[in-house]
Interface confidence: medium
Amino acid sequence: MGSAALEILGLVLCLVGWGGLILACGLPMWQVTAFLDHNIVTAQTTWKGLWMSCVVQSTGHMQCKVYDSVLALSTEVQAARALTVSAVLLAFVALFVTLAGAQCTTCVAPGPAKARVALTGGVLYLFCGLLALVPLCWFANIVVREFYDPMTPVNARYEFGQALYIGWAATALLMVGGCLLCCGAWVCTGRPDLSFPVKYSAPRRPTATGDYDKKNYV
């Protein structure tokens, strides 16, 4: 696969991952109540997220409450907020860095420095994935720990919510995408012969024999 193809695929994965991370960050389903006592008639389900908690009635009616005070929040929620939002914002920065270093854009002049910019974009996305992974795993650890804690009442036990799964999928996409972007740029820094001349009109590569794309000429 050529460096440009790796670049495009990596960027697409990172964008999907970024979208997934924003979704996971906003969804209230980080923790959902687990009903293990079958004698209890499930009247309602409780969801807990980073920004709000929701109660869903068996009728389908949902009532959500945004957390009032930051100070009243647990340390893990505050840390998860900070890390997840940081990851989302950093991914936004990474997007511009990646686009600047992309072979099909002109905002950074072609030349050796451009490969380094592309590599930086990939590394930033990789870091975004790792940054987002911390609160997700932290929350998952709390859920598991409390679930198996005999002191936790049965009706107060939580299990993994959809947001955690979306978040994990998003971090996987960010890290894989970041790796592909790094590979695309690394292919070029390590194997300059694979960094073909860029045709901004229609990104294509010359043939191995050194013939140039005729579209490039007037």
Partner: antibody, heavy 119, light 107 residues
Framework: QVQLKESGPGLVQPSQTLSLTCTVS????????VSWIRQPPGKGLEWMGV???????EYNSTVKSRLSISRDTSKNQVFLKMNSLQTEDSAMFFC?????????????WGQGVMVTVSS | DIVLTQSPATLSVTPGESVSLSCRAS??????IHWYQQKSNESPRLLIR???QSISRIPSRFSGSGSGTDFTLTINGVESEDLSVYYC?????????FGSGTKLEIK
Amino acid sequence: QVQLKESGPGLVQPSQTLSLTCTVSGLSLIRNSVSWIRQPPGKGLEWMGVIWSNGGTEYNSTVKSRLSISRDTSKNQVFLKMNSLQTEDSAMFFCARTPDGYYPYFDYWGQGVMVTVSS
Amino acid sequence: DIVLTQSPATLSVTPGESVSLSCRASQGISTSIHWYQQKSNESPRLLIRYASQSISRIPSRFSGSGSGTDFTLTINGVESEDLSVYYCQQSYNLPLTFGSGTKLEIK
């Protein structure tokens, strides 16, 4: 067919400014970069600078303070302006097509124009 | 700046024999080296790009190899028309730099 042709004065007075033009045919400057390279008599090649397809420029530090490269995309011309010329600046000046990419080289060259700096 | 050292400065060969021209970089530059041929009173001509990639319209007797700091241009079966100066050029870092050249003489 791709062609580059340099033009300008053959003789320049010391401390004066050199102005050269590279007229390009067969390719568009909007999608192609052009470098200037010089070669003093009996010596090797020295890259002076480039004007990229996006209009950005890069210069060799040895001439950066005295050199300016610009272009007119409508006329398909690239210009070199170099001030405070000295006798050691006497050289054959070439313009060359530089394919855009991370690692540039020169695939089409002009025939060159000889510039002598002398009073 | 990356310095390219070419050796030998002059090489005398008889037509038909094979020759190797050397270019050494002052630091690792992967495969971002390009070779040019300059005949007397002519402009340079690109022979090889990225250390080993051949260019169309260039005779197949010209080939390149190497990676890192050491590069070689090989001419298999030198012909009298190959009498020229050969330059290597790096594009790993700006400024782009050329070697001092190797002059090929025909015995």
